[in-house]
């Protein structure tokens, strides 16, 4: 579950000429509202279609009447986010109309009148807990400039709002792979986990406990290659018992892509690759300067400064596309399990497992919990044939026998200081650097490398490492 | 504890239909496989399907598939296998298993006999 | 459908020997093999997954190997309890397969 929220900024006159009459007038002042519809996927739907993940009202904007001979400005708007709550997951891809109202307050017999002023429509690619997106519709002589984003309601967390967070089993941290919820850091995420033994190379899944197949790949973990011999054509859902390819239309087929964008296959769907000018899921939004913040993901923008000009997005790793709009990094759902490591090598992923663990996800535990004893209070946790020591703290090692000096590693970088803590370490770090282990420069201008402190804590502080 | 509970054994006429069910407790019903696989008497084990809660999703054993429908109810965590156009060699123990958390049918139900005869 | 061939159908044996099954798939099933042990009007139990690696409560005894089309079940010190059926399987492709399986007898 989770919200939709959309941020409207400003609705007024598009460049170029032609300008459009006020909607308002001394005689017939008005004031603005809009209505946002969602729907799932890539719809193709008529507008009238259902708002299938939701729908929202914003607040009537104030009043305005427009001043005799001067040109629309841009109008008036109401306050606050509009917001479309969704109980079940996000779909990642999804259908946007925004419309655009005025209400007229004149002495008209029955109460306000109402008509529609403009309507846009677009398809998005949008993970949720992502940064704001920005974005540019036009309708006619109107043009609409507004932010969007999807974050997930608590316990539910991920770029799909699938994953939840479950309170701690221990107070200090989270079980192995397992990361602190945030903001609820008192708590830990419960990975997505898919059928297990599912191919980390050629499987997936949306759902829990599911194993869907990249294209070319079948059988109940993904792990057979498709033979194509026997088929007609080399496209479309595979048959799970012959493993056969049946014949698809190909999701580039009629080239959905506007603007002179190219389109490639994905093994679920398609991408386009947008010219200079141009971004959207289908390349279908254009006239736009570094001014509109084109760049998403955090992408740095260089160049544009009228719509005739070229930009250049340059990305953060991790994000690519002429916008920044296309993620690389597959690792961020966590396939690897028990605090593997995750190599995204581009064909495939890789988990690198941590002692005592195995397995394509790291999913086999190597040891055995029987007969083994944990010293100074540590405690064995079983799991599937497996043995692990909880060491409580101030303890290590494998068996909990040695005393854990957290300092003895030297954690604190650029010659911070450590302190032993009860819950950990503390670094104090020397002036000019940052962070829990101090590893962060402060910036001559007083920005840091990080995206922020956390709140209350200033650069330079000691910083505690859990 | 994981336990999955079968329903009391049946005796059917050549030609019917039986619908054998499985219930699941102590775990997130809707995360994981419910497999079935039957077994004739003094024989070996055949797999027969499976389905997938959350999402409904199942592959059938091709063997089966004309004659074989597997159901799930999530108000009662409960996976239905229906049998039809039943023969006597259909006589078998019928076994609900969870794929679990490693790959393989970590649990099963206590089985479930279904006799045909005339 | 890949067969699973289980050898020995029966085997004699005394508490204490080392006991050996073997089992050939039809075709390359990659490590995706299990072993589930059987006794009478009972449900099957699981052994070994990934042809190698033990479930959760499952002694040390008994050992999975193999990769591709051959794969071994061992039981280094047959004890009393584990007089019983034992049946690989495959789930690498659909349909999931089971060998015949293979009978443990007190000789």
């Known amino acids: 579950a989770g919200v939709f929220e959309l941020q409207i900024h400003s609705f007024g006159p598009g460049p170029g000429p032609g300008a459009p009459r006020s909607p308002c007038s001394a005689r017939l002042p008005c004031r603005l509202f809009f209505r946002v519809c969602l729907k799932p996927g890539l719809s193709e739907e008529a507008a009238e279609s259902p708002c299938a993940l939701g729908a929202a009202l914003s607040a009537r904007g104030p009043v305005y009447t427009e001043q005799p001979g001067a040109p629309a400005p841009d109008l008036p708007l109401p306050d606050g986010l509009l917001q479309v709550p969704f109980r079940d997951a996000w779909p990642g891809t999804f259908s946007f109309i925004i419309e655009t109202w005025r209400e007229e307050l004149g002495d008209q017999i029955g109460g306000p009148a109402w008509s529609l002023l403009a309507r846009v429509a677009g398809r998005r690619r949008l993970a949720a807990g992502g940064p704001w997106a920005r974005d540019i519709q036009r309708a006619g002589a109107w043009e609409l400039r507004f932010s969007y984003r999807a974050r997930c309601e608590p316990p539910a967390v991920g770029t799909a709002c699938t994953r939840l967070c479950r309170p701690r089993s221990a107070p200090s941290r989270c079980g192995p792979g397992l990361r602190p919820c945030a903001p609820l850091e008192d708590e830990c995420e419960a990975p997505l986990v898919c059928r297990a033994g599912c191919s980390p190379e050629h499987g997936f899944c949306e759902q829990p406990g599911e194993c869907r197949c990249l294209e070319g790949w079948t059988g109940p973990l993904c792990t057979v290659p498709v033979s194509t011999s026997s088929c007609l054509s080399p496209r479309g859902p595979s048959s799970a018992t012959t493993g056969c390819l049946v014949p698809g239309p190909g999701p580039c087929d009629g080239n959905p892509c506007a603007n002179g964008g190219s389109c490639s296959e994905t093994p679920r769907s398609f991408e386009c690759t947008c010219p200079r000018g141009f971004y959207g899921l289908r390349c279908e939004v254009s006239g736009v300067t570094c001014a509109d913040g084109p760049c998403f993901n955090g992408g740095l923008c260089v160049g544009g400064a009228d719509p005739d000009s070229a930009y250049i997005c340059h990305c953060p790793p991790g994000f690519q596309g002429s916008n920044c709009e296309k993620r690389v990094d597959r690792c961020s759902l966590q396939p690897c399990r028990n605090g593997g490591l995750c190599l995204d090598l581009g064909h495939a992923l890789r988990c690198r497992c941590r002692a005592g663990f195995a397995g394509p996800r790291c999913e086999h535990d190597l040891d055995d919990c029987a007969g083994r004893a944990c010293a100074n209070g540590g405690t064995c946790v079983e799991g599937g044939g497996a043995h692990r020591c909880s060491c409580a703290l101030g303890f290590g090692g494998r068996d909990c026998r040695e005393r854990a000096d957290p300092c003895a590693a030297r954690p604190c970088a650029h010659g911070g200081r450590c302190y032993a803590h009860f819950s950990g370490l503390v670094c104090a770090c020397a002036p000019g650097y940052m962070g829990a282990r101090c590893e962060f420069p402060v910036h001559p201008d007083g920005a840091s490398a990080l995206p922020a402190a956390p709140p209350g804590l200033r650069p330079g502080d000691p910083q505690r490492y859990l | 504890q994981v336990q999955l509970v079968q329903s009391g054994a049946e005796v059917k006429k050549p030609g019917a239909s039986v619908k054998v069910s499985c219930k699941a407790t102590?775990?997130?019903?809707?995360?994981?496989?419910i497999e079935w696989v039957r077994q004739a008497p003094g024989q070996g084990l055949e797999w027969m399907g499976e389905i997938l809660p959350g999402t409904g999703n199942t592959v059938y054993n091709e063997k089966f598939k004309d004659r074989v429908t597997m159901t799930v109810d999530t108000s009662t965590s409960t996976v239905y296998m229906e049998l039809s156009s039943l023969r006597s060699e259909d006589t078998a123990v019928y076994y609900c298993?969870?794929?679990?958390?490693?790959?393989?049918?970590?649990?099963w139900g206590q089985g479930t006999l279904v006799t045909v005869s005339s | 459908d890949i067969q699973m061939t289980q050898s020995p159908s029966f085997l004699s044996a005394s508490v204490g020997d080392r006991v050996t099954i073997t089992c050939k798939a039809s075709?390359?099933?990659?490590?995706?093999v299990a072993w589930y042990q059987q006794k009478p009007g009972k449900a099957p139990k699981p052994l070994i997954y990934s042809t190698s690696y033990r479930y959760s409560g499952v002694p040390s005894r008994f050992s999975g190997s193999g990769s591709g089309t051959e794969f071994t079940l061992t039981i280094s010190s047959l004890q009393p309890e584990d007089f019983a059926t034992y049946y690989c399987q495959q789930y690498n492709n659909y349909p999931l397969t089971f060998g015949g399986g293979t009978k443990v007898e007190i000789k």
């Open positions: 298993a969870r794929w679990g958390d490693y790959a393989l049918f970590a649990n």
């Open positions: 102590d775990y997130i019903f809707s995360n994981y496989y």
């Open positions: 075709q390359n099933v990659g490590t995706n």
